[in-house]
């Protein structure tokens, strides 16, 4: 919907989770609402309780199975409804046909670690979490490094246009504390978006050797 005050937006993590946010101006705060998922070609259906995340915004996670199980494919369509209780009955507030592989948002990368650090460079690796095997190598990454005295928003973005789960940061300052984050996005999907940023990894470059130019 063009109108930004009322939206029902969901993303699939490519394995067994659909996360939804329902925003609605003027909605009753104390009303009980839920998201109902009905796949077009599966025997299961799933429900989650919408919980407030702000004044006019609610969110919930549809857990479809074990975290690494492949519960949906590229041909699946899941009808998602927001239902709110009105007295003794449930009223449909919003509806959409959800195409999971057109609406992807992966989990944030995990297990960030420093592989090797020097005075001016640092090699960092990470892993992707709960990502479908369907992607094969069709993933891209963005990374950013927080330098002293700067904010994350000011950090330049480094783009890795392939499935590369490591990076060598260069032109760093010796004996300096940095933080590093990375996020991932599949190439597939018209409405696919970036994963959340990973937890920051803190590291420190080695001091310059005494008596040597740096």
């Amino acid at each position: 919907a063009v109108n930004g005050t009322s939206q029902f937006t969901c993303f699939y993590n490519s394995r067994a989770n659909i996360s939804c946010v329902w925003s609605q101006d003027g909605a009753l705060q104390d009303t009980s609402c839920q998201v109902h998922a009905w796949p077009d070609r599966r025997r299961w259906n799933q429900t989650c309780e919408l919980l407030p995340v702000s004044q006019a915004s609610w969110a919930c996670n549809l857990i479809l199975g074990a975290p690494d199980s492949q519960k949906l494919t590229t041909v699946d369509i899941v009808t998602l409804r927001v239902l709110c209780r009105e007295g003794v009955r449930w009223r449909v507030m919003a509806i959409q046909d959800f195409k999971p592989f057109e609406n992807l948002r992966l989990m944030a990368p995990i297990s960030l670690q420093v592989v090797h650090v020097e005075t001016h460079r640092c090699n960092i690796s990470w892993e992707i979490s709960q990502a479908s095997h369907y992607f094969e190598r069709h993933l891209e990454f963005e990374a950013r490094t927080l330098s002293p005295g700067h904010t994350w928003e000011e950090a330049p973005l480094l783009t890795l246009k392939q499935k590369q789960e490591w990076i060598c940061l260069e032109t760093l300052t010796p004996d300096t504390q940095y933080e590093f984050q990375v996020r991932v996005k599949p190439l597939q999907g018209e409405f696919t978006t970036w994963s959340p940023w990973s937890q920051p990894l803190a590291f420190r470059t080695k001091p310059a050797a005494l008596g040597k130019d740096t």
Partner: nanobody
């Protein structure tokens, strides 16, 4: 952009039936929610029914449940509203509307609207 053109309205008697059509065109029609709304003289526009394009899942207003049926023909990019057991209070201008991604969180909020077709039920 989505363009919507309604047709099929007219003057009918109480208890009669009618079929309204909405021809949709535009790039995002294939993933839209399509709805019918109506506005009676001197009243606010009200939700009647909605259908999802891909699976044909439907939602109806209580006032028309069991009497009106919304359907779609994907090949013709057309949405229909079959009105039966018509009552004088069904007299209104009927509007076709479309909701495209990101989808509305409110069945009353749509992105694109047709110009409407008049339905008059006389007793």
């Amino acid at each position: 952009q989505v363009q919507l053109v309604e047709s099929g309205g007219g003057l009918v008697q109480v208890g009669d039936s009618l079929r309204l059509s909405c021809a949709a065109s535009g790039r995002t029609v294939g993933s839209a929610n399509m709805g019918w709304f109506r506005q009676a003289p001197g009243k606010e526009r009200e939700f009647v029914a909605v259908i999802t394009w891909s699976t044909g899942s439907t939602v109806y207003a209580d006032s028309v449940k069991g009497r009106f049926t919304i359907s779609r023909d994907n090949a013709k990019n057309t949405v229909y509203l079959d009105l039966s057991s018509l009552k004088p209070e069904d007299t209104a201008v009927y509007y076709c509307a479309a909701d495209v991604y990101p989808y509305s969180g409110n069945l009353n909020i749509m992105d694109y609207w047709g110009k409407g077709t008049q339905v008059t039920v006389s007793s």
